[in-house]
Structure formats: C-alpha cells, structure tokens
C-alpha cells in the first residue's frame, strides 16, 4: 500500500506512477504488493 | 551487453501447442522481470505475459490467459512461453524483454514467428 | 479502459523536426507512458518513459535528438535533426496495476516517414 507520508512526498506526481515504480520492484524482489 | 534471442518458432496447426525459448546473456537473469510480447504481421504490438526474477509471480492478458503459461529456468538463463490450444490470431512475431528498474520493456529480442495455421 | 491512441503516420524532411502525439483516455491523464522505437525488420527499442509533468529517462544510446514533453492527456515525442535511420514505427505504451493485476496496452503506432 502506498503510505500517506510517500504520497505527500510525491505530490504533484500520478498515483499510476508511484504504483508504475512498486511495480517494477516488485518483480526484481518479488516482495507482495497488497 | 544485454543479449535476448528468441528460438522455438514455427508452424503450427490451429489446436496444438507450441513452447518458445529467450535464451538472456549480458546480465544477471535471475535479478529481473521478463515480459513476452507479440506483433501480428503488419500490425501492432500485444503484451502476452510477465513473470517476476524468481518466477514466483505471472501476469496475462485475458486474450492468453488460461493458454498461455510463462516460466523460466534461472540456472539456465532462459525464459519459456509455453502456449495451448493455438489459434490463427496467434499467429506473430514473439518477443521477448528485460525490465530495469525504471520501465517494463527495456531490452528486446530480435523475435521469432509462430504462424497458426492448418 | 485504458487506452492509447496515435495517428497512424506522419512525414517530416531530413534534417527538420518532426513532433509525435500519444493520447491517453481522458481518465488517465495524468499516467506516465512509455515510446518505442521499431525500425523496419527490426525488434522494437526503448526510447524514453514519459511523465505528466514533461519529466523523461531516455534508454541506454538513445542520442539526444529524441525528447519528449507532455501537455494534459497528450504525450509527445520530438525527434529533432532527422536522419534517416529514424524512419520506423513509434509506439507509445502503459501499463497498470489494478487489484493485483497487471495490464500493459500499447498504441497502434506512428509510421514516421522522412522525406528527401
């Protein structure tokens, strides 16, 4: 989950973006994106 | 350098299976995502399939999903697309791609061709 | 739905500029979107990832003729100083993930034609 305190440090970027980068990380460390 | 070369494609009747090949060197394999994707002849391009570094997670479009089954063989190098029950809309150039950490599709093959047909 | 759309082709001279539009359905507009490069016989290359702000990572030996720029759902590409290796098809693309789901759609693709 996308915790409030990265939201406001990435703010003015897309949700979609900040998902895009999880994403990506998680399928180099394979941790869980529940 | 990052090398993908895909192998494994050929004809087909409509029905049958069909396992592609991406043999990877240039990089450590087993520290990155690997996507297939596919382009008809004269068309666009189709994401078919992604699986995590260690394989634990897959992802499809609903076009493949429940035919189509990407694995990978990290002690190998390689990545696989097993693909069933064939159709002629198969029919296409197949890629394979490596991540980075920054986008999905950064490295590509120079493909192979499956053409479904009886 | 997320959708990508292009115009199917586009024609500049050698040595001019020529600028690509990529447009993102209306609802995700504010969506980072990727350009692809495939020259004729070719596999695709990776240009650039593309944000809502203008914001670009270009690939590796990617030279810097190519840049990219944003202006609410439309995403552009600019290829400056035409040369002709840089007559190929160009695809936008994105990707999504939704209740653990991935799904990546690409656009149909702009014939980029160079002329003289």
């Known amino acids: 989950a996308v915790s409030e305190h990265q939201l406001l440090h990435d703010k003015g970027k897309s949700i979609q973006d900040l998902r895009r980068r999880f994403f990506l990380h998680h399928l180099i460390a394979e941790i869980h994106t529940a | 350098q990052v090398q993908l070369v895909e192998s494994g494609g050929g004809v087909v009747q409509p029905g049958r299976s069909l396992r592609l090949s991406c043999a990877a060197s240039g990089f450590t394999f087993s520290s990155y995502g690997m996507s297939w994707v596919r382009q008809a002849p004269g068309k666009g391009l189709e994401w078919v399939a992604t699986i995590s570094s260690g394989g634990s997670y897959t992802y499809y479009p609903d076009s493949v999903k429940g035919r189509f089954t990407i694995s990978r063989d990290n002690s190998k190098n390689t990545l696989y697309l097993q693909m069933n029950s064939l159709r002629a809309e198969d029919t296409a150039v197949y890629y394979c791609a490596r991540q980075t950490t920054m986008t999905y599709f950064a490295y590509w093959g120079q493909g192979t061709l499956v053409t479904v047909s009886s | 739905q997320l959708v990508l759309t292009q115009s199917p082709s586009a024609s500049a001279s050698l040595g001019a500029s020529v600028k690509l539009t990529c447009t993102l359905s209306?609802?995700?507009?504010?969506?980072?979107i990727e350009w692809y490069q495939q020259q004729p016989e070719k596999g695709p290359k990776y240009l650039m990832d593309l944000k809502q702000d203008g914001s670009h990572s270009t690939g590796d030996g990617i030279p810097d003729r190519f840049s990219g720029s944003s202006s609410g759902a439309e995403r552009y590409l600019t290829i400056s100083s035409l040369q002709s290796e840089d007559e190929a098809d160009y695809y936008c693309?994105?990707?999504?993930?939704?209740?653990?789901?991935?799904?990546?759609?690409f656009g149909g693709g702009t014939k980029l034609t160079v002329l003289g």
């Open positions: 209306s609802q995700h507009s504010t969506y980072t």
């Open positions: 693309g994105v990707g999504d993930t939704i209740k653990e789901q991935f799904v990546y759609v």
